[in-house]
Amino acid sequence: SQPQAVPPYASENQTCRDQEKEYYEPQHRICCSRCPPGTYVSAKCSRIRDTVCATCAENSYNEHWNYLTICQLCRPCDPVMGLEEIAPCTSKRKTQCRCQPGMFCAAWALECTHCELLSDCPPGTEAELKDEVGKGNNHCVPCKAGHFQNTSSPSARCQPHTRCENQGLVEAAPGTAQSDTTCKNPLEPLPPEMSGTMLM
């Protein structure tokens, strides 16, 4: 006696018109509505009445179209596991967490569950930039030509060598991958170790 326009409707082949928003209820052999994100099943459908949905209570959520009789409990980001919050829990979405600065995800089970400190990159190298921060440990790559990095650090970036001429100075010692260029005043005498070379 229920028209076909809306659930519940009979289904002989156990499939429903809209798999995302409907489900097959085997007891009555009918298709019923799922509850939208942010809600849960307050009353299962019957042969004459569709699923009744209710809003998730505070501090709980359901992310998908569902036929769950409860909402999932919101969980905080665990700082002991190195996680921090980037977006709060809503009725439609769980708390969004990421690894704290200087950490990477060491354990992944659908989402990150445990972060560890990023490895240091030695002088002369820097961490390769990743698409997503905190996704993996550092992969250290040498500074490109004309750049240096002089610390052991998980996050320090290679910097360009100082151009002495831009400051009205002259180069006293060239830069390396681990050190900057040494500049001096053009009128300054050469350091003692270089004075012999100058006399020649």
Epitope: S1, Q2, S42, I48, C53, A54
Partner: antibody, heavy 126, light 107 residues
Framework: QITLKESGPTLVKPTQTLTLTCTFT??????????VGWIRQPPGKALEWLAL???????LYSPSLKNRLTITKDTSKNQVVLTMTNMDPVDTATYYC??????????????????WGQGTTVTVSP | EIVLTQSPVTLSLSPGERATLSCRAS???????LVWYQQKPGQAPRLLIY???SRPTGIPDRFSGSGSGTDFTLTISRLEPEDFAVYYC????????FGGGTKVEIK
């Protein structure tokens, strides 16, 4: 607090169409689980269920009267309208509308008409 | 279509006595889908029991419902003067039809 009130003609002639309006307050027919039903009671006789409309647009009709009944809702006006064609003197009765969908103290939903209107008496006579 | 048969049609009892009203379905119901109403003369019905055995807020605990499948019972443990009325069962399993009612009258 939920209230419902029926309105419509008190007297109709045989073969005419009866149109009854149920105006309600205290709930919305767009809320999941809500329904409004129509029930009638001839003088000195038992209750007879006629039709029900749910929040999602689902409609149910008494099998014995299905061909004569139409139920519609106007969510914005908080109204449900029942039309019954080809009226006959045996259709003389008190017509009630009722809210369907009961929530218990724990927030669980149950089927049942928990609040009724006062009823409106309709007499079918030439 | 499920037919609900209520018995007895009339029950003559005195205040303080126990009343047992029966509602029988022509085919098995899911028990959650049976409700009971009380109707007094000149008044609209009042929901008395939902889900076959649960009482709404404000309904005295002398009213109780039980049963499953095809046989359901409404019991009034000790009749009060205001309990003399007509009682209807209704099913929500397939369609929503009522039983024919049981009148509880003063003996």
């Amino acid at each position: 607090q939920i209230t419902l009130k029926e309105s419509g003609p008190t007297l109709v002639k045989p073969t005419q169409t009866l149109t009854l309006t149920c105006t309600f307050t205290g709930f919305s027919l767009s809320t999941s689980g809500m329904g409004v039903g129509w029930i009638r009671q001839p003088p000195g006789k038992a209750l007879e269920w006629l039709a029900l409309i749910y929040w999602n647009g689902g409609k149910l009709y008494s099998p014995s009267l299905k061909n004569r009944l139409t139920i519609t809702k106007d969510t914005s006006k908080n109204q449900v309208v029942l039309t019954m064609t080809n009226m006959d003197p045996v259709d003389t009765a008190t017509y009630y509308c009722a809210h369907s969908g009961y929530y218990d103290n724990s927030g669980y939903y149950w089927d049942g008409m928990d609040v009724w209107g006062q009823g409106t008496t309709v007499t079918v006579s030439p | 279509e499920i037919v609900l048969t209520q018995s007895p049609v009339t029950l003559s009892l005195s205040p303080g006595e126990r009343a047992t009203l029966s509602c029988r379905a022509s085919q098995s119901l899911i028990s959650d889908y049976l409700v009971w109403y009380q109707q007094k003369p000149g008044q609209a019905p009042r929901l008395l029991i939902y889900g076959a055995s649960s009482r709404p807020t404000g309904i005295p605990d002398r009213f109780s419902g039980s049963g499953s499948g095809t046989d359901f019972t409404l019991t009034i443990s000790r009749l009060e003067p205001e309990d003399f009325a007509v009682y209807y069962c209704q099913q929500y399993d397939t369609s929503l039809n009522f039983g024919g009612g049981t009148k509880v009258e003063i003996k």
